[in-house]
């Protein structure tokens, strides 16, 4: 080994070196949190970049760059270091117009902490392993969601557009003439029934067990879907999103109530099956796989 390489190895294995890098990263993170950093922080920024460059050079000199088995670029953690340095120099010395987008990559410096703290490295390793193992479960989940999204599409397409419409119109007004002029919230509130404090018109349905309209109102299918048009089963993608919402139980009871009011109480069976399969079974299956991956990593 050349003297330069010997010195590099000595520096690399020294505990003070790791301590210096860790302190640098933490200090860098503190500086990154500043809202309006003073001008002198620019010099501090250069210092940080210098330390990171020094760290990488030491690693490259000690281990080699990329040819051998244990060289610098063969370790995925060093890819992060390399990217951090490349972006540091790019944002500083190359005029790329919209630099603010590239400055976002400075946040990657905080991730360097992972490679320095051994415990954290193990946890992240386990996380990556679990993601690899999750691929089969994810395929199963997406498949199940897709099947139920298709069923939902068939059962509830367009149903969430059912609204209670006022039974008194001007002489020149018809349902279609109103449909063509509905634009503002004011227009909607003029013609549709709203429960107090509700941002959406009261939903209704045409089957006997669905929601009925109050006196003076009739159920029609007009206008947009509830929640600014984001809640519906009108296309496969919206149905898939609704199913994902059921699986994650994200305010699912509202979707359940809306759909049952528009389609009929019989369809609660659909929701029972989805909640049992999607929410109770698949979510726990995902957790089990993650737990297994952590267990393996710890062993």
């Amino acid at each position: 080994f050349s003297p330069l390489r010997r010195i590099s190895i000595k520096i690399l294995v020294h505990s003070l070196f790791s301590m210096l890098i860790m302190c640098t990263i933490l200090t860098n993170c503190i500086f990154m949190t500043m809202n309006n950093p003073p001008d002198w922080t620019k010099n501090v920024e250069y210092t940080f970049t210098g330390i990171y460059t020094f760290e990488s050079l030491v690693k490259i000199l000690a281990r080699g760059f990329c040819v051998g088995e244990f060289t610098f670029l063969r370790d995925p953690w060093n890819w992060l270091d390399f990217v951090v340095i490349v972006f540091a120099y790019l944002t500083e010395f190359v005029n790329l117009g919209n630099v603010s987008a590239l400055r976002t990559f400075r946040v990657l410096r905080a991730l360097k902490t992972i490679s320095v703290i051994p415990g954290l490295k193990t946890i992240v390793g386990a996380l990556i392993q679990s993601v690899k193992k999750l691929s089969d479960v994810m395929i199963l989940t997406v498949f199940c969601l897709s099947v139920f999204a298709l069923i939902g599409l068939q059962l509830f397409m367009g149903n969430l557009k059912h609204k209670c419409f006022r039974n008194s119109l001007e002489n020149n007004e018809t349902l279609e003439s109103i449909m063509n002029t509905l634009e503002s919230e004011e227009d909607f509130r003029k013609y549709f029934y709203y429960l107090e404090g509700s941002k959406d018109a009261l939903l209704c349905g045409f089957s006997t067990d669905s929601g009925q309209c109050p006196e003076g109102y009739t159920c029609v299918k007009i206008g947009r879907n509830p929640d600014y048009g984001y809640t519906s089963f009108d296309t496969f993608s919206w149905a898939f999103l609704a199913l994902f919402r059921l699986m994650t139980q994200d305010y699912w009871e509202n979707l359940y109530q809306q759909t049952l009011r528009a389609a009929g109480k019989t369809y609660m069976i659909f929701f029972v099956v989805v909640i049992f399969l999607g929410s109770f079974y698949l979510i726990n299956l995902i957790l089990a796989v993650v737990a297994m991956a952590y267990e393996e990593q710890n062993q």
Partner: nanobody, 124 residues
């Protein structure tokens, strides 16, 4: 294709009576906001004559008040327009309008569904 069946039109003398009927008997017709009668006289715009909402409340054009009566038979899914004291200016093509919701089999659709029209001629 959704069809409204209108009948009862014809030639009548001034002061006479006619009863128009509009049947939305097809299973496609689910629920109306209103079913009404409109007319188009030669060289004029189509205008409302009378309409009846699904709860039974009625609405008449000024020219029809006191002379015309609109009614419905929910069991037969039919709306009637009883026209009394007819005048020559009542001569027009009378259209039935179902303004509400129909079923296409796959989904529900709300909108205006017009009949073909029945001709009423008032002349001596």
């Amino acid at each position: 294709e959704v069809q409204l069946v209108e009948s009862g039109g014809g030639v009548v003398q001034p002061g006479g009576s006619l009863r128009l009927s509009c049947a939305a008997s097809s299973r496609q017709f689910i629920r109306d906001v209103f079913t009404g009668w409109y007319r188009r006289a030669p060289g004029k715009q189509r205008e409302l004559v009378a309409r009846i909402y699904n709860e039974g409340n009625t609405q008449y054009a000024d020219s029809a008040k006191g002379r015309f009566t609109i009614s419905r038979d929910n069991a037969k899914k039919t709306v009637y327009l009883q026209m009394n004291s007819l005048r020559p200016e009542d001569t027009a093509l009378y259209y039935c309008l179902f303004s509400g919701t129909i079923s296409t089999g796959r989904e529900y659709r709300s909108g205006d569904y017009w009949g073909q029209g029945t001709l009423v001629t008032v002349s001596s």
